[in-house]
Structures are given as structure tokens and as C-alpha cells.
Interface confidence: low
């Protein structure tokens, strides 16, 4: 009887995002010990990466990588083509844009090469994995005497994102943020003209094409206004 | 060859309904979310409801709560049921798989789409 562990990995969405199903085993030996878990991020539909924790093995092992589309056109067993290494054991695999179908249920299975038996397959929902480059071209508009306008771009289409846009002054010891949906602009309504503005943005593959939890990075911030630095007495926190 | 189909548009006053259909040769819809798009004259096309092979729905917070998206899995159908309407959907409105056209946005194809005007 195979052994099946239900596992959240932080993507819930209305069934289990994740399975972990182990080979039956005998008697008690190498092959009971566990496979590390295989953590996957697609990176702005372009390419994906599967990586675990080689060092969590008792010994330096290369483990291999195999995945699958369920139920799909795509379901014929692949052999991963592109490992990724640590101190040269195998640490991961990354797939090609090619090779990514985001609604479809995408089957990984890791194995011991060494121990056959010894395998751990897990099912993820690829659309739930999309991690977005981080937003460009941050631009700025004066809208009128106290009105800002924050305008930016990202590499992907509009609509599949939403966006986190931070702000704050020197003088300010946090960030203010707002969140913002596919239309990425942001607007400020009331600026002080005499403080010095920052403006950050991250964006997330939600909700519309998928269920992602996870942020892009920070884009590069942008600044306005008169810089009073001389005069903050907060500015050296901040920059710490 | 791929084909779409749109139909179910019309001229309909402000508050009314329509049910739009669209019909998806195979290897489009199968394994596939899909989704309505809508495209008003001198703007981006953009996504207004997507639906997952499993029944998952999403949708642009304009239209949340007026339209409902669903599909019949063994006819290769995907609807869009649109009520309260307002003159601001006026658009044509395309289906298509979403990952096709995350895939090659540029290059995916289209079908005739089907047009929507919501007008007193």
C-alpha cells in the first residue's frame, strides 16, 4: 500500500496544491529514508526552477528528476535535461518555457539512482509557482500642485498582475503602502513639496490568472522631490 | 488548424443581459484554463474572466458579481453570462486558452470575436 502525505506548500487553492506519495518498502532500510521536498517557481512564464536540499542526504547523492502533465496531452514521462548543481551534486532542474503548461497539474518525481524504490512524487499547480520579474521603468508625473502620478512597467501582461506600491519620505520611519490592481498606476494625492519622496514597486501573478503567493522583487526605487537629507535625523536608520 | 468561435453579442439597453458562447476546437480547450477577454475601441485587449479545467473561476473586479464564466468540459464550450450591463463593457469580446496566450501573446490566434454594445 502506498503511503500518501497531504503537504500545504503555501499555495492552497480549492484541493491540495501538493502530494507526496513514497514507494512501499519491505523492510527498514536506505529506501525508507525520506526524499528532500522539490520546491518549484516559474519565473515570469520563461523558465522554471525545481530545486531541493541535496545536503539533507546522509551522503553526497545525485539524485534525478522526472516530471509529467496529468491527464493531459503532455502526460508522457520527461527526463530532466538541464540539472543544477551544488558543490557538483545535482540540486535541481530547470525547464524551458517550453516545457511549461501553467494549468495543467505538473507531477514531479525525484529518485535515488542507487535505490530505485526510494522515489517521492509530488502534484503542483504551476499557476499558483509564477514568481514576475520585478516592475521597470518606474516614471513619475505631476498631476497638479500636490498630485503625483507613479506609472511602471512589467514584463508580462497587464492583467495577470497586481502590484504593492511602497512610498515614504526621509523623514518617515516606514514604508506606506497601497496596493494596486492590473492597471499599475498609482496616484498620490496630497505632496509636500518640501520633503523627498521615494516610490518602490513589487508585483504578484493574482488573482485573475492564477493564485500566487509569492511577490516579485523590489523594482528599483524612484525619488522625488527637494532632498532634505541634511537636515533628517532618521536618515541614517533608514539607509542602514 | 485551430479554431475559435464567439457568438451571443448584440445591442442591448443599460441593465440588460446577454449569454455569449464560444466554441474551442480541442487542442485549445482541452487540459486548458480559458478565458473572455474584451477589447474596446482604442484600447488593449484585456482578460475579464478566466475559468480553470476544474471549474476554478477568476475574475476583473469590474465585472465581479454581473458576469459568470463556465464551460462544458465535453462539448468544447466556454460562456460568459453578462447581466447588469453598463455601457462601459461595450467592447468585441474574444475567448481563448490563457496559456496559449501567455505562451506567444504576440502570435496567438483569434477568433472573429463577437460584439457587445450596451447603449440606451
Known amino acids: 500500500l502506498n503511503t500518501t502525505i497531504l503537504t500545504p506548500n503555501g499555495n492552497e487553492d480549492t484541493t491540495a496544491d501538493f502530494f507526496l506519495t513514497t514507494m512501499p518498502t519491505d523492510s527498514l532500510s536506505v529506501s525508507t529514508l525520506p526524499l528532500p521536498e522539490v520546491q518549484c517557481f516559474v519565473f515570469n512564464v520563461e523558465y522554471m526552477n525545481c530545486t531541493w536540499n541535496s545536503s539533507s542526504e546522509p551522503q553526497p547523492t545525485n539524485l534525478t528528476l522526472h516530471y509529467w502533465y496529468k491527464n493531459s496531452d503532455n502526460d508522457k514521462v520527461q527526463k530532466c535535461s538541464h540539472y543544477l548543481f551544488s558543490e557538483e551534486i545535482t540540486s535541481g532542474c530547470q525547464l524551458q518555457k517550453k516545457e511549461i503548461h501553467l494549468y495543467q497539474t505538473f507531477v514531479v518525481q525525484l529518485q535515488d539512482p542507487r535505490e530505485p524504490r526510494r522515489q517521492a512524487t509530488q502534484m503542483l499547480k504551476l499557476q499558483n509557482l509564477v514568481i514576475p520579474w520585478a516592475p521597470e521603468n518606474l516614471t513619475l508625473h505631476k498631476l497638479s500642485e500636490s498630485q503625483l502620478e507613479l506609472n511602471w512597467n512589467n514584463r508580462f501582461l497587464n492583467h495577470c498582475l497586481e502590484h504593492l506600491v511602497q512610498y515614504r519620505t526621509d523623514w518617515d520611519h516606514s514604508w506606506t503602502e497601497q496596493s494596486v490592481d492590473y492597471r499599475h498606476k498609482f496616484s498620490l494625492p496630497s505632496v509636500d513639496g518640501q520633503k523627498r519622496y521615494t516610490f518602490r514597486v513589487r508585483s504578484r501573478f493574482n488573482p485573475l490568472c492564477g493564485s500566487a503567493q509569492h511577490w516579485s522583487e523590489w523594482s528599483h526605487p524612484i525619488h522625488w522631490g527637494s532632498n532634505t537629507s541634511k537636515e533628517n535625523p532618521f536618515l541614517f536608520a533608514l539607509e542602514a | 488548424q485551430v479554431q475559435l468561435q464567439e457568438s451571443g453579442g448584440g445591442l442591448v439597453q443599460p441593465g440588460g443581459s446577454l449569454r455569449l458562447s464560444c466554441a474551442a476546437s480541442?487542442?485549445?480547450?482541452?487540459?486548458?484554463?480559458m478565458g473572455w477577454y474584451r477589447q474596446a475601441p482604442g484600447k488593449q485587449r484585456e482578460l475579464v474572466a478566466s475559468i480553470t479545467s476544474g471549474g476554478d473561476t477568476h475574475y476583473v473586479d469590474s465585472v465581479k458579481g454581473r458576469f459568470t464564466i463556465s464551460r462544458d468540459n465535453a462539448k468544447n464550450m466556454v460562456y460568459l453570462q453578462m447581466s447588469s450591463l453598463k455601457p462601459e463593457d461595450t467592447a468585441v469580446y474574444y475567448c481563448?486558452?490563457?496559456?496559449?496566450?501567455?505562451?506567444?501573446?504576440?502570435?496567438?490566434?483569434w477568433g472573429p470575436g463577437t460584439q457587445v454594445t450596451v447603449s440606451s
Open positions: 481563448n486558452a490563457q496559456e496559449r496566450v501567455y505562451s506567444d501573446y504576440a502570435f496567438a490566434s
Open positions: 480541442g487542442s485549445i480547450f482541452s487540459g486548458n484554463a
